[in-house]
């Protein structure tokens, strides 16, 4: 994994295959945008602490349409071990403010990363 | 009201199985993640398992991994921990939880414990 | 594999009194963590999520402050109910492992 050859996981235990795809596929989104991605459409910020799978899957399911986000979704179902229906919002939400699709897959690969170098991955 | 009722607990010969079973009711099961946490006589808690709400992923604890099984029937808002081969160290009070909705951190509702000897 | 710390062992207080629990993680856990009471022959209660937010019907003299690797459950003022056990719990990233304290 070239691209995250800066902030490769500190233990012994290498990341799940999964989170590792979903760090890929948000890396991607982030380098592959030209055009403004899912026609800017915003979303609910959410709280990067506890549950933010849950709640990132929360708010993305919202934006319908966007291919480009797609695969995310569905990879963040298998973060999220509830059920998670559009127009859902759990208790963690900040719901004040409203980013950009773009700004936000940026603003949740950023904290993976952040986990990585605490490693906080099992 | 809702709550978490448990039931299969018993005494059982090393090496022999034995599967629990917890109701759930007063609230939507079926889009609910669901945990198993084990306590031993005098002893601090010790986690299990866990279940998506659909079943399609499950996590163990490296103690139980390979003998026990989480399963769940949205049907019957159940949910299941078939143990095998189980071990004296197994010996536990066995406790179905609830995930907290939206989050992976906590257990919100628990069942009233089943004793696995 | 996190381990959690709780200290101390045992608190001996009095009703009236102010009770601070301490959790220590082995390493940082951001603020995933969780805090429950536990009373003889019974299930354990949930007090605290996500570090410092009280859960639903938990009275306003439960506290939790701290993130990364210390962190504390004041009960500000005890109550006769609130002798009993308490533990701190955790979970890693990912995979969902996870992991609760020695109890206090």
């Known amino acids: 994994l070239t691209c995250l050859g800066g902030f490769a996981s500190p233990g012994p235990v290498p990341p799940s295959t999964a989170l590792r795809e979903l760090i890929e596929e948000l890396v991607n989104i982030t380098q592959n945008q030209k055009a403004p991605l899912c026609n800017g459409s915003m979303v609910w910020s959410i709280n990067l602490t506890a549950g933010m799978y849950c709640a990132a899957l929360e708010s993305l399911i919202n934006v319908s349409g966007c291919s480009a986000i797609e695969k995310t979704q569905r990879m963040l179902s298998g973060f999220c071990p509830h059920k998670v229906s559009a127009g859902q919002f759990s208790s963690l939400h900040v719901r004040d403010t409203k980013i950009e699709v773009a700004q936000f897959v940026k603003d949740l690969l950023l904290h993976l990363k952040k986990l990585f170098r605490e490693g906080q991955f099992n | 009201q809702v709550q978490l009722v448990q039931s299969g607990g018993g005494v059982v010969q090393p090496g022999r199985s034995l599967r629990l079973s917890c109701a759930a009711s007063g609230f939507t099961f079926s889009s609910y993640g669901m945990h198993w946490v084990r306590q031993a006589p005098g002893k601090g808690l010790e986690w299990v398992a866990i279940i998506w709400y659909d079943g399609s992923n499950k996590y163990y604890a490296d103690s139980v991994k390979g003998r026990f099984t989480i399963s769940r029937d949205n049907s019957k808002n159940t949910l299941y921990l078939q143990m095998n081969s189980l071990r004296a160290e197994d010996t536990a009070v066995y406790y179905c939880?609830?995930?907290?909705?939206?989050?992976?951190?906590?257990?919100?509702?628990w069942g009233q414990g089943t004793m696995v000897t | 594999e996190i381990v959690l710390t709780q200290s101390p062992a045992t608190l001996s207080l009095s009703p009236g009194e102010r009770a601070t629990l301490s959790c220590r993680a082995s390493?940082?856990?951001?603020?995933?963590l969780a805090w429950y009471q536990q009373k003889p022959g019974q299930a354990p209660r949930l007090l605290i999520y996500?570090?410092?937010n009280r859960a639903t019907g938990i009275p306003a003299r439960f506290s939790g402050s701290g993130s990364g690797t210390d962190f504390t459950l004041t009960i500000s003022s005890l109550e006769p109910e609130d002798f009993a056990v308490y533990y701190c719990h955790q979970r890693s990233s990912w995979p969902p492992i996870f992991t609760f304290g020695p109890g206090t």
């Open positions: 996500d570090a410092s």
């Open positions: 939880a609830r995930l907290w909705f939206g989050d992976l951190d906590a257990f919100d509702i």
């Open positions: 390493q940082s856990v951001s603020s995933y």
